[in-house]
C-alpha cells in the first residue's frame, strides 16, 4: 500500500475517502483506525455498523464519523472540527473474523487556520481524551505518495 | 536507519542570529512532522518548535515565537531553525527529532548541536 | 501548561534490582505520556509511547503504567546499561512538556 496525504485545517473539517473493490470485499465492516506508532498497534477509532446492510447508516466516535457505500466501494470518514492532535497516521480496514485487511493507508496533516491570526502556538486545544477526539466537509486536498516511499508496516 | 544529522551550532553573541540545519536520511522524510528539542546545560528537555509534513504550519513554544523560524526543504530531506534575537537563555544543546505525527512523542533524535549565547 | 513532575530526583539501586520511578502531570492527560532514556554524553532515546507502548528494540523489562495523573516506569532486573537519566513527556496535546528527569544510578 502506498500512502494517501489528506490535508486539513484546525477547526474545520475532513473527509477522507478509501475506495475498495465492492465485490472482494463483500458483506465485510469496515474500520478507521490510528497507528499509535511506527510498529506500534493500529488503534480502533470508529468501525462500520455491526449489520452490513445498514453500512450507509452513519455512525459517530465523538468527532469521527463513518460511512460506507457497500455498492460503489468507498468508505468515507469524517473527521469534524479537526484538532492539530487530529494528525497522524490511520488505516481504512475491512473486517473479516479478527482479522483485518488494510484498504488504504493515510497520513492526516494539520495546517493551522490560515485566517485565524493568532500564532500558530496560540491554537486552541481542547481537553485531553483518551479517543481520538470529538466529530462536514468542507476542506480536503489529498495526494498519493509514490509507491515503494511508505516506511510504514502494516498493522501490528 | 534512520539518521538525523545537525549541524550550524556554535558560539554567538547576545541579539545575533544562527541557523541550524538537519540533515535526515533512512525514511521519508516528507512523511513526518518533525521538530527541534533543547537541553540546557545540565538541565531537562524542553520542545522548541515542531513542523507539519508539508511545512504548511508551524508550533512553537512561547518563549521562542516571534524570534525562531522553522522550516524544512523535503526535495533535499532537510530541516531547518533559523534563531534570531538570541538570548543568554538559549544557549542549550539543540537536537533534531522525528516528531510522531498528532502523538507529539519523538522516536529518533540527532546527536544534538551545541549553541552558546554569550557576550 | 500541564507540569509534569518526576521522583525520585536520583536513586542508586544493585544489578538485578526491580526499580519504578514516578511521573506526575498537573492534571489529568489520559494515558498521553512517553519516558525517554538518556544516558551520559547522548542523546536521548524513546523507551514508551501511550504510557505503555514499547519502541522499537526497547528490552521487555521496562514497563510502563499508569492514568490520568499518576504514572509509572519500572525496569525490572536492572542491568549496568540502563544507568541513565529518565524522563517523562506528556503527548499528544500542545505544547508537549517533560519532567525534571530521573536519575537512576548502579552501586
Known amino acids: 500500500h502506498n500512502t494517501t496525504v489528506f490535508q486539513g485545517v484546525a477547526g474545520q473539517s475532513l473527509q477522507v475517502s478509501c475506495p475498495y473493490d465492492s465485490m472482494k470485499h463483500w458483506g465485510r465492516r469496515k474500520a478507521w483506525c490510528r497507528q499509535l506508532g511506527e510498529k506500534g498497534p493500529c488503534q480502533r477509532v470508529v468501525s462500520t455498523h455491526n449489520l452490513w446492510l445498514l453500512s450507509f447508516l452513519r455512525r459517530w466516535n465523538g468527532s469521527t464519523a463513518i460511512t460506507d457505500d457497500t455498492l460503489g466501494g468507498t468508505l468515507t470518514i469524517t473527521l469534524r472540527n479537526l484538532q492539530p492532535h487530529d494528525a497522524g497516521l490511520y488505516q481504512c480496514q475491512s473486517l473479516h473474523g479478527s482479522e483485518a485487511d488494510t484498504l488504504r493507508k493515510v497520513l492526516v496533516e494539520v495546517l493551522a487556520d490560515p485566517l485565524d491570526h493568532r500564532d500558530a502556538g496560540d491554537l486552541w486545544f481542547p481537553g485531553e481524551s483518551e479517543s481520538f477526539e470529538d466529530a462536514h466537509v468542507e476542506h480536503s486536498i489529498s495526494r498519493s505518495l509514490l509507491e515503494g516511499e511508505i516506511p510504514f508496516p502494516p498493522t501490528s | 536507519e534512520v539518521q538525523l544529522v545537525e549541524s550550524g551550532g556554535g558560539l554567538v553573541q547576545p541579539g545575533r542570529s544562527l541557523k541550524l540545519s538537519c540533515a535526515a536520511s533512512g525514511f521519508t522524510f516528507s512523511n513526518y512532522y518533525m521538530a527541534w528539542v533543547r537541553q540546557a546545560p545540565t538541565k531537562g528537555l524542553e520542545w522548541v518548535a515542531s513542523l507539519t509534513n508539508s511545512g504548511g504550519s508551524t508550533y512553537y513554544r512561547d518563549s521562542v515565537k516571534g524570534r525562531f523560524t522553522l522550516s524544512r526543504d523535503n526535495a533535499k530531506s532537510t530541516l531547518y531553525l533559523q534563531m534570531d534575537s538570541l538570548r543568554s537563555e538559549d544557549t542549550a544543546t539543540y537536537y533534531c527529532?522525528?516528531?510522531?505525527?498528532?502523538?507529539?512523542?519523538?522516536?529518533?533524535w540527532g546527536q544534538g548541536v551545541m549553541v552558546t549565547v554569550s557576550s | 501548561n500541564i507540569v509534569m513532575t518526576q521522583s525520585p530526583k536520583s536513586m542508586s539501586l544493585s544489578v538485578g534490582d526491580r526499580v519504578t520511578m514516578n511521573c506526575k502531570a498537573s492534571?489529568?492527560?489520559?494515558?498521553?505520556l512517553a519516558w525517554y532514556q538518556q544516558k551520559p554524553g547522548q542523546s536521548p532515546k524513546l523507551l514508551l509511547y501511550y504510557t505503555s507502548n514499547r519502541f522499537t528494540g526497547v528490552p521487555d523489562r521496562f514497563t510502563g503504567g499508569g492514568y490520568g495523573t499518576d504514572f509509572t516506569l519500572t525496569i525490572n532486573s536492572v542491568q549496568a546499561e540502563d544507568a541513565a537519566f529518565y524522563y517523562c513527556?506528556?503527548?499528544?496535546?500542545?505544547?508537549?512538556?517533560f519532567g525534571g528527569g530521573t536519575k537512576l544510578e548502579l552501586k
Open positions: 492534571q489529568n492527560v489520559g494515558n498521553n
Open positions: 527529532t522525528r516528531e510522531w505525527a498528532g502523538s507529539g512523542y519523538f522516536d529518533y
Open positions: 513527556q506528556r503527548i499528544y496535546n500542545s505544547p508537549w512538556t
